[in-house]
Amino acid sequence: AVNGTSRFTCFYNSRANISCVWSQDGALQDTSCQVHAWPDRRRWNQTCELLPVSQASWACNLILGTPDSQKLTAVDIVTLRVMCREGVRWRMMAIQDFKPFENLRLMAPISLQVVHVETHRCNISWKISQASHYFERHLEFEARTLSPGHTWEEAPLMTLKQKQEWICLETLTPDTQYEFQVRVKPLQGEFTTWSPWSQPLAFRTKPAALGKD
């Protein structure tokens, strides 16, 4: 069908991983498909097996090297092909010229920890994971705090427009359980998107001293 519902989307984590999702309505769940990576100026080729993630979509990770190795640069073009088995042969379903630093999605921030907590305030820090040194300080963050009786979707977003791997949360309620998440995005890249949210960090504010508010 013309204007079919196929979709092939990939992101580079800025170091040694390209994650891809292939979706095609009407495809059988047990269809065997792969992603092949063919760089324009590198000696390696790489393949990953697409595995089902929902009724009509499959995903895989092209592992290009050790997690912190810098395998691609802004001048690279990697041609990515979706190949699916049809009977005894492999058939190309989609093909894409992929500019890695135009299609970035970093790994979720890690190592969240409470640096200091008070009755109304909490200082939290985190680290970025597997992020290229090319970015220097050209990163931004979004953070959100889950308050009792609310959902993550209701939590207001706090934007940090610089590479700042800490935040001081204020106007918190004493003796109250909260959760905190953060995500990161490079400023570079036309199709770049936010990282997944970090694992939530649970913390509790200190109780107010007796006789004080």
């Epitope: 079919g4 196929s6 058939r91 093909i95 894409q96 010229d97």
Partner: nanobody, 124 residues
Framework: EVQLVESGGGLVQAGGSLRLSCAAS????????MYWFRQAPGKEREFVAA????????LYADSVEGRFTISRDNAKNTVYLQMNSLRPDDTAAYYC?????????????????WGQGTQVTVSS
């Protein structure tokens, strides 16, 4: 949205060759996948070939693989379809099409804009 104008169609004998051209106007051409489709009388429009924005990657329908070659010249904002060993069943109106900016090229097509088409007739 790019504007597309096809040319190069005509009448040719079986076994002959034709080269279709598709001239695109628009600043996004060099980052769009491009396609050729065809439609024979009384039949649905069908995928013929596709090419990625840099020209590194190509995709063909089984019926034309090895006979047709898609290529592009981003400096000239033009995509081509070289058709060799033509057969009577290649007779159709041939349409150039552009996919979304920065997207992949698909066997089933994801199309943003279409040309008006050029007629190819292969006589036996």
């Amino acid at each position: 949205e790019v504007q597309l104008v096809e040319s190069g169609g005509g009448l040719v004998q079986a076994g002959g060759s034709l080269r279709l051209s598709c001239a695109a106007s628009g600043s996004t051409f060099s980052r769009q996948p491009m396609y050729w489709f065809r439609q024979a009388p009384g039949k649905e429009r069908e995928f013929v070939a596709a090419i990625t924005w840099s020209g590194r990657g190509t995709l063909y329908a089984d019926s034309v693989e090895g006979r047709f070659t898609i290529s592009r010249d981003n400096a000239k904002n033009t995509v081509y379809l070289q058709m060799n060993s033509l057969r009577p069943d290649d007779t159709a109106a041939y349409y150039c099409a552009a996919g979304p900016y920065g997207d992949a090229a698909y066997r089933h097509g994801r199309i943003d804009s279409w040309g008006q088409g050029t007629q190819v007739t292969v006589s036996s």
